[in-house]
């Protein structure tokens, strides 16, 4: 299953299969994700090692059993991979480090006036993997707001340097924000030249391009077909690149197709895995496993379950049946490829489903009345659960936030339906920024169901939680996607970065925005709390977040939004916003409906119709 | 409208014990906290404890532990101070009051005379 | 236990005077302070909660101002219905009121 865990001051000992330099350990941990054979990694930031060479060290790692020996190391940080955990998975990374040098070969400078634009840069950039940019503070005035843009073999810094005033990060290209665009046709009987940058086999165009779209320097890609004039050149997928980012050549050629890596693409990524089942092939590999089972999607499904395994053979010969089963060939190879593909089997072959981002049917949760006031413009897929909660009766209106907890699932404040309980007028618009954006022809959601809280009572503030069933599930993207719940009465974890977000008003007395709003705001506690509301129960149900000052709050329009918060690299549903006195006023708080405590009604109420829990119960 | 109506004047010997009652209206009891204060007689104003009708969680006065005891019965919207071992020092009016952080609307009081 | 030290125990003033309370803790308070009106046979009445916050309904000639443990309350023009007594009272940590102030028409 899938494990989100890390381990302070742990080191993993043995099971190496590469290694790289990381600026911090979510960013081993995504590598570890899309490695084919990494289940675990352990990463050494800067102050947990004297030794130069090994600072920023991210160890992937993999075990026959799933697990590894762990050593105390203080400062060190472990975990597991995110393969198996649906829609967590991602390449995007966002994250800026400062008083950081990422190195690679600088191939483009330029001056910038923030890392935000370096950032964009590296992100239009077809060759830019990582960027470094010196701030204005720079101890060399020649070098500052120089932008840098680099790459490396791997895709990963070849050595990080703490270095003052310099702040570095990635390119957003895998977050589907490139402005560069892509190339989505497949050029059939066209070979491209260049430089081939990795070889492996694949059993059609497609899984090629998707490979090569999630390898680090691949640009363009040939793939020789199964009838191809050369046998040992059969069904290989050729990874290329060039200095200019574009072949510079093609040859018409028979039997081979060519296609470019969707990396580029803005809006829409493939996932990372490869859904399909070749009927009448065999994948062959290293044999992980045998079992017996009745079909070929339950043999899919065992591979997808078994962590390790990264594609299987279901066999239909006779002497491999018994009854209704017959043998399921689970197996793997270094690169996560079949080391061989034969055809015209009695078999059927295919890929296991770990790394797609749909997963089942589930929502995350973690193993372990009131725009927003004093905010800032947010950018695209930065909070993909984000929703808009509209109402149309004569005119169309933005009236509440929400969050995507899952496909099918919106969770939400109680009080947003008070008065409008008829799920007709409302209309649920998700993965996007901008409500002008909104027409007539923006995809909604509708509601089939409205779930309010069996002890919310209208004008009160106690138990404003109300969850809304989706008329059809949504499909999850870079900027639609659910965010986590916290574990069932998750009291012991100390959140420290977060934010509220909606596009409520921007003072009391305001008016809906455009753009939706982030805020990062502090939680104050519940006894701190109290002593600022003299007529309110602040009770253990709710989750208080504020400035001593003021001047940053939600407001009117934010109402059923997220307050998430950022722990270990993961965000979590901490809170919806329910109410406050006015907005963003001094010593007054804003109050959340705290999620932790209601995490029992809310996977109750998600039970689907056969009985089946549409959400992962937390540990 | 928002009312705590608290139980009549009471005389009792000393050393008996005595229970008040304060019903609220306009609201519910679960959705606040009550408070209990003591007003001597040509005296100030002293807290007693705060209970939580939803949940029963109690906070006393450390100078009052054991002489008061708080509880709620939320189906009937009441809420009580049971006093025991009564001595003429206890002779007051005990007020119930509602809030959050702090007591927002008080009943009128209730006299306690404590005489042998 | 916090203490809460009220003055003057009583004072008389005209109608219209400025009326000034004080109240001395002996911790800081971080500002969890408020000031109760009672007048006889009545139970007592918030006026001000968090320093200076002025509770709904209560007219804008009470204030208050303070920090750390040294606080004030303010009738900015006394009135005849403002013939009461008026207690400081803490919410720092549990509850402690002051002594009072017994205020008269002169």
């Known amino acids: 299953g899938c494990l989100t865990q890390l381990y302070e001051n742990a080191f993993f000992r043995g099971g190496d299969v590469a290694s790289m330099y990381t600026p911090n350990a979510q960013y081993c941990q995504m590598r570890c994700t899309f490695h084919p054979r990494c289940l675990l990694f352990s990463f050494l930031p800067a102050s947990s090692i004297n030794d130069m060479e090994k600072r920023f060290g991210c160890f992937l790692k993999d075990s026959v059993t799933g697990t590894l020996p762990k050593v105390h190391r203080t400062g060190a940080v472990s975990g597991h991979s995110l393969k198996q955990c649906g829609h967590q998975i991602s390449a995007c990374h966002r994250d800026i480090y400062k008083g950081v040098d990422m190195r690679g070969v600088n191939f483009n400078v330029s001056k910038v006036s923030s890392v935000e634009e370096c950032q964009k840069r590296c992100t239009s950039n077809i060759r830019c993997q990582f960027f470094s940019y010196a701030t204005q503070t720079f101890h060399k005035a020649e070098y500052r707001n120089n932008c840098l843009l680099k790459y490396s073999p791997g895709g990963t810094p070849t050595a990080i340097k703490v270095l003052s005033n310099v702040e570095s990060g990635f390119s957003l290209k895998p977050c589907a924000l490139s402005e560069i665009g892509c190339h989505m046709n497949i050029f059939q009987h066209l070979a491209f030249s260049d430089v081939d940058v990795a070889r492996v086999l694949t059993p059609d165009a497609f899984v090629c391009r998707t490979i090569c779209t999630y390898h680090p320097n691949c640009l363009f890609f040939t793939f020789y077909t199964n009838v191809w004039k050369i046998e040992s050149q059969r069904n290989v997928c050729l990874l290329k690149t060039s200095e200019s980012g574009t072949p510079s050549s093609s040859t018409p050629q028979e039997n081979t197709i060519s296609g470019y890596s969707l990396l580029t693409c803005k809006r829409t990524l493939p996932e990372p895995c490869h859904s399909k089942i070749y009927p009448g092939v065999d994948f062959g590999g290293e044999e992980l496993n045998v079992t017996f089972v009745k079909g070929v999607n339950v043999c899919q499904e065992t591979c997808t379950k078994m962590i390790r395994c990264q594609f299987f053979t279901y066999s239909l010969l006779p002497e491999d049946c018994k009854e209704e089963k017959c043998k399921c060939f689970l197996r793997l190879s270094m690169d996560g490829s079949p080391t061989r593909i034969a055809y015209g089997t009695q078999g059927s072959s295919g890929y296991s489903l770990r790394l797609c981002n749909t997963g089942d049917n589930s929502v995350c949760t973690t193993k372990t009345s009131t725009r927003i006031v004093g905010g800032t413009n947010s950018s695209w897929g930065e909070w993909p659960w984000q929703v808009s909660l509209q109402v149309k009766l004569t005119a169309q209106r933005h009236l509440c936030g929400g969050s995507l907890i899952g496909h099918q699932w919106v969770l939400t404040a109680a009080h947003c339906f008070d008065g409008l309980p008829l799920q007709d007028v409302w209309r649920i618009y998700s993965g996007i920024l901008n409500l002008s954006d909104i027409t007539k022809d923006t995809p909604f959601s509708q509601i089939k169901e409205i779930i309010i809280h069996q002890n919310y009572k209208v004008s009160e503030g106690n138990h404003d939680i109300a969850l809304i069933k989706l008329q059809a599930p949504l499909n999850y993207t870079e900027f639609q996607k659910p965010i986590c719940l916290p574990s069932k009465g998750d009291t012991s974890t100390i959140y420290t970065n977060c934010w509220v977000t909606g596009w409520g008003f921007s003072k009391e007395k305001g008016e809906i925005q455009n753009i939706l709003q982030k805020v990062n705001i502090p939680l104050v506690t519940n006894e701190e709390c109290q002593k600022r509301y003299q007529d309110y129960k602040i009770t253990q149900r709710m989750v208080c977040a504020g400035y001593k000052e003021g001047g940053k709050d939600a407001c009117k329009g934010d109402s059923g939004g997220p307050l998430v918060c950022k722990h270990n690299g993961m965000w979590r549903l901490v809170g919806i916003t329910s109410w406050g006195e006015g907005c963003a006023r001094r010593e007054q708080p804003g109050v959340y409906t705290k999620v932790a405590e209601y995490m029992d009604w809310i996977l109750e109420k998600t039970q689907s119709s056969d009985g089946k829990a549409q959400m992962q119960s937390p540990a | 409208e928002v009312q705590l109506q608290q139980s009549g004047a009471e005389l009792v010997k000393p050393g008996a014990s005595v229970r008040l009652s304060c019903t609220a209206s306009?609201?519910?009891?679960?959705?606040?906290?009550i408070f209990w204060v003591k007003q001597r007689p040509k005296q100030g104003l002293e807290w007693i404890g705060r209970?939580?009708?939803?949940?029963?969680?109690?906070k006393y006065d450390p100078k009052i532990q054991g002489k008061a005891t708080l509880t709620a019965d939320t189906s009937s919207n009441t809420a009580y101070l049971q006093l025991s071992s009564l001595t003429s020092e206890d002779s007051a009016i005990y007020y119930c009051?509602?809030?959050?952080?702090?007591?927002?609307?008080w009943g009128q009081g209730t006299l306690v005379s404590v005489s042998a | 236990d916090i203490q809460m030290t009220q003055s003057p125990s009583a004072m008389s003033a005209s109608v219209g005077d400025r009326v000034t309370i004080t109240c001395e803790a002996s911790?800081?308070?971080?500002?969890?302070i408020a000031w109760y009106q009672q007048k006889p046979g009545k139970a007592p009445k918030l006026l001000i909660y968090?320093?200076?916050t002025l509770q709904s309904g209560v007219p804008s000639r009470f204030s208050g101002s303070g920090s750390g443990t040294d606080f004030t309350f303010t009738i900015s023009s006394l009135q005849p219905e403002d013939i009461a007594t008026y207690y400081c009272?803490?919410?720092?940590?549990?509850?402690?009121f002051g002594q009072g102030t017994k205020v008269e028409i002169k």
């Open positions: 009051a509602k809030g959050g952080g702090l007591f927002a609307y």
């Open positions: 306009g609201f519910n009891i679960k959705d606040t906290y």
């Open positions: 209970i939580d009708p939803e949940n029963d969680n109690t």
């Open positions: 911790h800081d308070i971080n500002n969890y």
């Open positions: 968090y320093t200076s």
């Open positions: 009272l803490q919410y720092d940590n549990l509850f402690t």
